[in-house]
């Protein structure tokens, strides 16, 4: 069964700055990701990025840079300041869809006892979902 | 969690008409576009035709002139009007919700499908 990780990390240098780095274990294309805050994409949470293989990015603020890691996994740089900027036990959310196949979709935060700088390995957290 | 749900497909003859519905639940945010993408066995995965969020409807070249995409914002639904429908339009159809890169809308969620036959 696909899945999908959510690593969330606060930058040491800016500690209002996030980087989340998603990833999809499984087999098949994907058609899009799709990065989001406070819920999941489809359920009250608000999009940060979406990356499509071939036809490019698009970001909102406060993202800062969404980029390819892989072919199956992908980061984004968030800038904290002012009204918009995440906090500590922000979730964050990415969606992997393969159209028509179907999406898979998890989620996760800042783990509470982390340090700047250091992060926890990349596990599959178990919001999953496939349409 | 987004639910779209199409209905209106069958089989019809060559020339025919079908008019396919898509009633969504609710959007993503930001998403930008909805449309229509369709598939045959054995050909390549086809954007028919989506409305941007400025209302603009856009169609692949296949079926301008021939096929109208609508909206109606009140019940949150999609509509392809398919008129003097050939057998290569015989597909699944499947209606989209996504986000905008260019002229191409990239389905973000997506209906389970609906089978369109036109036989000659």
């Known amino acids: 069964t696909p899945e999908v990780w959510v690593q969330v990390r606060m930058e040491a240098t800016e500690l209002s700055s996030f980087t989340i780095r998603c990833g999809f274990l499984g087999s098949g294309s994907i058609s899009l990701v799709t990065v989001s805050w406070g819920g999941p994409n489809g359920a009250g949470g608000t999009t940060l990025a979406v990356l499509h293989p071939e036809r490019g990015i698009r970001q909102w603020a406060p993202a800062r840079q969404a980029r390819w890691e892989t072919q199956s996994s992908i980061s984004l740089i968030l800038e904290g300041s002012g009204a918009s900027s995440p906090c500590a036990n922000t979730t964050f959310c990415c969606k992997f869809a393969s159209f028509p196949e179907g999406s898979w979709e998890a989620c996760g935060s800042l783990p509470p006892s982390s340090d700047p700088g250091l992060s926890a390995p990349p596990t599959p957290a178990p919001i999953l979902r496939a349409d | 969690q987004v639910q779209l749900v199409e209905s209106g497909g069958g089989s019809v003859q060559a020339g025919g008409s079908l008019r396919l519905s898509c009633a969504a639940s609710?959007?993503?945010?930001?998403?930008?576009?909805m449309g229509w993408f369709r598939q045959a066995p054995g050909k390549e995965r086809e954007g028919v035709a989506h409305?941007?969020?400025?209302?603009?409807?856009r169609y692949v070249e296949s079926v301008k002139g021939r096929f109208t995409i609508s909206q109606d914002h009140a019940k949150n639904t999609l509509y392809l009007q398919m008129n003097s429908l050939k057998p290569e339009d015989s597909a699944t159809y499947y209606c989209?919700?996504?986000?905008?890169?260019?002229?191409?809308?990239?389905?973000?969620?997506w209906g389970q499908g609906t089978q369109v036959t036109v036989s000659s």
């Open positions: 409305i941007d969020s400025d209302g603009i409807p």
């Open positions: 609710r959007y993503t945010s930001r998403t930008d576009c």
């Open positions: 989209v919700v996504g986000f905008k890169f260019g002229d191409y809308c990239a389905p973000n969620d």
